[in-house]
Amino acid sequence: AQEVQQSPHCTTVPVGASVNITCSTSGGLRGIYLRQLGPQPQDIIYYEDGVVPTTDRRFRGRIDFSGSQDNLTITMHRLQLSDTGTYTCQAITEVNVYGSGTLVLVTEEQSQGWHRCSDAPPRASALPAPPTGSALPDPQTASALPDPPAASALP
């Protein structure tokens, strides 16, 4: 079965820094979402080879991509405290397949010592019933809620 390998599990970064999240699959994708989890899940990007990526307005101008949809590294720049949260990759194949999630902790520089990642993957605090066409459920964890998206159709 198709899987999504996602790394890192957790990262602690100061305000203004950057973070890399990598989503790797064995191929055969139509595209991949990076989603910030929470009571109101929030798409950050949708990436499909050969198509201009869709990026949420909150991250426009501070997202870079490298690689292809099968092995994609997403770099989020100039992180803000409100970017703290759990981000998961959703690969679109004939079913939905989810990564294990990346917990991003954005901290004030002086409080770096207070917030550290453990080695464990991020904990999903509440799991909804998985969509029937999904390889894994879409975990929900509390996070800062972003502004509503302003992404629209791609040609």
């Epitope: 899940p41 798409d43 949708y46 949420d56 194949t93 079913v95 939905n96 969509p131 879409d138 992404a151």
Partner: antibody, heavy 116, light 107 residues
């Protein structure tokens, strides 16, 4: 059992506006993408709009800039705001659960929109 | 946009018959093809997704096949409740597009 119930259809003049609603039950609404599909009087099916579970929206060129899809995860409701309506928008409008980016596995019974 | 064509707009068959409905795409769609059934009352149901996967609750007399640009839906043993219009739909690329439908009637 998953149920989708559309409402808000009616008769509207060209250039007018209408807002359709789709109430969902029996599913974890926030975990699913949702779509609107319409059926013309000639019985052709046309995809109208989609919204991913994370809020990205997608439209065909025929409605882009005139229609807006949105969702209220707290109330389990999907919306379609239609403006600058044209006679060619006359159709039965269905909402559907979008299981995997275009695979529409549950449909509502539809609501009729007439632009005349 | 990808155009979906169902060349047969209506089809008449007898109960118990094996019926095949065809659908072709204007370019390859990598098996991202669904089949829907619309009953005379307007109710729409998904029958087959990803070319050949039977949706839950759909009788096993329905099957799908195909690849590239050419796809088909087969009903192996026609029953009265199968009277409906059948639509194919591609979901390989936006915008999602549907065939014109094939109306199935009983002889």
């Amino acid at each position: 059992e998953v149920q989708l119930v559309e409402s808000g259809g009616g008769l509207v003049k060209p250039g007018g506006s209408l807002k359709l609603s789709c109430a969902a039950s029996g599913l974890t609404f926030s975990s699913y993408a949702m779509s609107w599909v319409r059926q013309t009087p000639e019985k052709r099916l046309e995809w109208v709009a989609s919204i991913s579970s994370g809020g990205f929206t997608y439209y065909p060129d025929s409605v882009k800039g005139r229609f807006t899809i949105s969702r209220d995860n707290a109330r389990n409701i999907l919306y379609l705001q239609m403006s600058s309506l044209r006679s060619e928008d006359t159709a039965m409008y269905y909402c559907a659960r979008d299981e995997v980016r275009g695979y529409l596995d549950v449909w509502g019974a539809g609501t009729t929109v007439t632009v005349s | 946009d990808i155009q979906m064509t169902q060349t047969t707009s209506s089809l008449s068959a007898s109960l118990g018959d094996r019926v095949t409905i065809s659908c072709s795409a204007s370019q390859g769609i990598s098996n991202y093809l669904n089949w829907y059934q619309q009953k005379p009352d307007g109710t729409v149901k998904l029958l087959i997704y990803y070319t050949s996967s039977l949706h839950s609750g759909v009788p096993s007399r329905f099957s799908g096949s195909g690849s590239g640009t050419d796809y088909s839906l087969t009903i192996s043993n026609l029953e009265p409740e199968d009277i409906a219009t059948y639509y194919c739909q591609q979901y390989s690329k936006l915008p999602y597009t549907f065939g014109g439908g094939t109306k199935l009637e009983i002889k």
